[in-house]
């Protein structure tokens, strides 16, 4: 039930006075006023920016907003030697070379400070090759290259298309598979819809538009000097040879029409099926090297980037809690851009500005909430979630003992088709009945509501009549208080028809061309569709942290964690034989599933019936809802990944950017039959079935009576 | 084939306007941006402006933005150009051209039209 | 805006011989470079675009090269249909702008 049950306020002062105040013609003036001039993490620029953030939060009416600093390692382009790629002839003459930035969107030709494309810590080197088009560069990709093609990538340079994975997983396979350097470009097949022009006239991307990005593989460990503690004034950072996650080899992002350059004269093998084919006039054969005529001709990268220690800053605003001031509900997005940030991050941080001025509007009136609620303007998202993770290890003592939840409020679109929501199964509940109150922006559904557009455009796969609500993966500011710290977390935005779009993410997503005018021209222009996440993320925020019985559901944890018993049990049965030598089951972790589901069963039997006016009993059977995510956390992480700790979720090993559900068995299971020790492999399953199933045991028993 | 036929050209006072039009035939014109080049006599070319598919956004010289407009009517295939002011430097022939998108080549041009400005 | 200079302004070449016309932008124009061909009292023809892509048509003696700055256009071997006269084009930002043009003539 939405409840208005705060202390000090008047009945006026609920959730629906809350959603009121929320206007769209206010996220448009923010989003404006935020995407003017580039906000790259590490400049003045966005040092301004988060002043002005501090300033206006004040304004605003919250109790307190201050500057969180820390300084972290950053990757900048070399700004007098610019990084590019060239095709070399025999006598080692550049032929061709690939451009060194994007041509500006007009209005905003003489802009400065636009930082060309690269790949945010790439090493420095000038490798020169033979070239593999090696597809997505996802495991499978090189699963078929090198066991079923047998084309050795070793020594090579790497051209891959942008799309299906996060990046750094594609250039963590790339260095595994032996390559000297890895190119990234962006297909028209994964970037460009059919029938939409690119930009400036439509929101696709031009031959010239190139995705930046980071390209680390950090597993959740922040600053990648620093890992586990934060970037302080004191701190003991590791030598550049001991960081986390950085890549071996240089990388570099280029656009279309300089990949079709080096794709159309690529020899070799043809491409082992159409999957691997873009839509590119080009035979997108395999490699390695150019065709009979280009058989001399080389790839050579010029890669001079450098990495930084620089000052980052983070906002943190506090609204305090009326009754429960030691209990916190963060809402956090981010501030830094790559260029202009139109979408990312400045349409989700423009929802988190009018979100806090409609709570402040409740608080000058009177009016605070039960408990506390943190806002937070992250800085170093770009580069790998750092502003976040460093001030959650600064402050994690606190925020383990006292975190409710997080929502998470990145970009507010990536399309304008239908909602989309990844969250702990401990708000399923939240949201559903959230968007049952909440009116549907969508054409065709007006009078109707949010859950109704919501299920009919993205319908649940198991549960017919109710929406599809993803998994929690990573490649955003959650990731450390869910995967490390265990506090419930959620995510919303407006998305694209998967059905219909089946590129990657949005065309412009990390190009110049990310601009307001995309915006505002193409995807959003009466904003009704960041009015509609606004009110989600602001009616979840609201309901963590203004009901009197925290809107968790622990039998939805029971539901899901049986699927994903299901799930990791059938892929384990693909190997019958192995299973019954090794003395493989998985009883233990069924039964305390089923174990899990009668508790789970029995507390909220106890939710519904106990004295709500008793303080004691409250704050009792809440800190069980509050502390059932942390019970997730496994205390030594998972295997080579130490700050990812949930046992029940974790971010992919092979995308990032996906969740996986019991990470630690499927990890062991994973590509088990190419194993050279059989014996070990299925061991580490064993453990890994233990570890599962005992942590999902002790889990349960947090919810037991608790004498 | 891609045919493009500018007309209204001439002689015109100073002070004086002028409309000039380009037939277009031979490809889907709202597929493309289109433009106008003009070429003064023994001089090299001069971008004008040019308009984008569905004519929502233009662009223009800066020195001649407030005297000159760009225009399009798909449903005529037609690219016009309303020259207001026209002053003696106007004197040139004018090309209508075809582009792809906003940073593309003109790949395709028409013949040219010659407008004289001269009292 | 971005100016755009050409050199020479006007060659001297016989048939079969290598010729090669250069343009220097006045700032990185991003491979956001044209070639056009113009024979007296014709409308121009595009050549090459996006600095080395022959457009349709055109005789793979012409080639397109450069990056940042500085651009080439290179005809192999000179044919007597290709004297008249050159003009390379930036699309990279507004407004559009050309070389002065480079005249090749028959020595």
């Known amino acids: 039930k939405s409840s208005n049950e705060a202390t000090n306020i008047t009945p006026k002062h609920n959730m629906k006075a809350f959603l009121d105040e929320l206007k769209a013609e206010n996220i448009k003036k923010f989003l404006y006023n935020f995407t003017q001039i580039p906000h790259l993490a590490g400049t003045e620029q966005n040092f301004q920016l988060a002043k002005q953030i501090q300033s206006q939060w004040k304004e605003f009416g919250l109790d307190s907003v201050e500057l969180a600093h820390y300084d972290v390692l950053l990757s900048y382009p070399n700004k007098t030697h610019p990084n590019y790629i060239s095709i070399i002839n025999e006598d080692g003459n550049e032929i061709f070379n690939t451009s060194l930035f994007e041509p500006p969107p007009p209005g905003y030709e003489n802009v400065s400070d636009i930082v060309p494309p690269f790949s945010a810590f790439s090493p420095q080197g000038m490798p020169e090759g033979d070239l593999v088009y090696v597809n997505y560069a996802r495991t499978e990709d090189f699963f078929k290259l090198e066991r079923d093609m047998k084309i050795n990538c070793s020594g090579k340079i790497v051209i891959a298309r942008y799309g299906k994975v996060f990046r750094g997983n594609k250039v963590k396979n790339a260095q595994l598979a032996g390559a000297k350097g890895v190119i990234l470009y962006s297909d028209p097949a994964d970037y460009f819809a059919p029938g939409v022009k690119s930009y400036p006239d439509g929101w696709n991307l031009p031959g010239g538009g190139v995705q930046r990005g980071n390209i680390l593989n950090l597993n959740g460990a922040g600053d990648p000097l620093t890992p586990g503690y934060p970037a302080n004034e004191y701190a003991y950072r590791r030598g550049i040879a001991e960081a986390v996650g950085l890549p071996s080899i240089p990388v570099h992002p280029i656009g279309y029409y300089d990949a079709q350059k080096l794709l159309e004269k690529m020899g070799g093998s043809a491409p082992p099926d159409s999957s691997w084919r873009g839509s590119l006039k080009v035979p997108y054969n395999v490699g390695p090297g150019f065709t009979g005529n280009f058989s001399t001709q080389k790839v050579k990268m010029h890669i001079h980037s450098t990495n930084e220690v620089t000052r980052i800053y983070n906002v943190i605003g506090t609204l305090r809690g009326a009754v429960e001031p030691d209990r916190y509900v963060i809402l956090g997005g981010h501030r830094d851009s790559w260029v202009f940030g139109g979408i990312d991050p400045q349409s989700g941080a423009a929802v988190v500005h009018e979100i806090v001025r409609s709570f402040g509007t409740l608080k000058k009136e009177g009016w605070r909430p039960r408990r506390t609620i943190l806002f937070a303007s992250w800085d170093a998202e770009e580069f790998g979630l750092l502003g976040s993770t460093e001030w959650a290890e600064e402050n994690s003592r606190l925020l383990q003992e006292r975190g409710v939840a997080y929502i998470n409020a990145d970009s507010s679109i990536e399309g304008n088709y239908t909602l989309r929501v990844d969250c702990t199964p401990l708000m399923y509940s939240l949201v559903h009945n959230l968007t049952k109150e909440l009116k549907s922006p969508d054409e065709g559904f007006e009078g109707k509501s949010l859950y109704e557009s919501w299920t009919k455009k993205s319908p649940s796969p198991e549960f017919s009549g109710m929406p599809r609500i993803s998994k929690l993966g990573s490649g955003n500011d959650f990731e450390v208080f869910f995967q490390r710290l265990g506090i419930a977390s959620g995510r919303a935005r407006y998305t694209k028809n998967w059905e219909t779009n089946k590129f990657s993410g949005y065309p412009l997503y990390h190009s110049v061309y990310e601009t307001y005018e995309l915006v505002e021209k193409f995807y959003d222009p009466m904003f009704k569709y960041h009015l509609t996440v606004a009110q989600v993320r602001g009616g979840m925020v609201f309901e963590l942290a203004n009901s009197i019985v925290l809107p968790f559901d622990c039998r939805d944890y029971a539901v899901v964690l049986r699927k994903y018993a299901d799930k990791i049990y059938s892929i384990s049965m693909k190997h019958p034989q192995e299973m019954k030598t090794y003395s493989v089951s998985f009883d233990s972790l069924f039964s305390a599933v089923k174990n899990f589901t009668e508790i789970a069963s029995k507390f909220s039997e106890r939710l519904q019936d106990f004295d709500k006016s008793n303080p004691i009993v409250l704050r009792m059977m809440n800190d069980q809802l509050m502390f059932l995510e942390r019970a997730f956390i496994d205390p030594l992480g998972l295997p080579d990944r130490p700050f990812y700790r949930h046992v029940i979720y974790a971010p992919s090993s092979h995308n990032k950017y996906a969740g996986e559900s019991f990470p630690g068995i499927y990890d062991a299971l994973f590509d088990i039959e190419s194993k050279v020790d059989p014996s070990k492999a299925w061991g580490e399953v064993k453990r890994q079935i233990y570890v599962a199933a005992f942590t999902v045991q002790a889990a349960a028993e947090t919810l037991s009576e608790v004498a | 084939e891609v045919k493009l036929v500018e007309s209204g050209g001439g002689l015109v006072q100073p002070g004086g306007s002028l409309r000039l039009s380009c037939a277009a035939s031979?490809?889907?014109?709202?597929?493309?941006?289109m433009a106008w080049v003009r070429q003064a006599p023994g001089k090299g070319l001069e971008w004008v402006a040019n308009i984008n598919y569905d004519g929502s956004s233009t662009y223009y010289l800066d020195s001649l933005k407030s005297r000159f407009t760009i225009s399009r009517d798909n449903a005529k295939n037609s690219l016009y150009l309303q020259m207001n002011s026209l002053r003696a430097e106007d004197t040139a022939v004018y090309y209508c051209?075809?582009?792809?998108?906003?940073?593309?080549?003109?790949?395709?041009w028409g013949q040219g039209t010659t407008v004289t400005v001269s009292s | 805006d971005i100016q755009m200079t050409q050199s020479p302004s006007s060659l001297s070449a016989s048939v079969g011989d290598r010729v090669t016309i250069t343009c220097r932008a006045s700032?990185?124009?991003?491979?956001?470079l044209n070639w056009y061909q113009q024979k007296p009292g014709k409308a121009p023809k595009l050549l090459i675009y996006y600095t080395s892509s022959l457009h349709s048509g055109v005789p793979s003696r012409f080639s397109g090269s450069g990056s940042g700055t500085d651009y080439t256009l290179t005809i192999s071997s000179l044919q007597p249909e290709d004297f008249a006269t050159y003009y390379c084009q930036q699309g990279n930002r507004l407004p559009r702008t050309f070389g002065g043009g480079t005249k090749v003539e028959i020595k």
């Open positions: 031979g490809f889907t014109f709202s597929d493309y941006y």
């Open positions: 051209a075809r582009g792809g998108d906003y940073w593309d080549a003109m790949d395709y």
């Open positions: 700032q990185d124009i991003s491979k956001y």
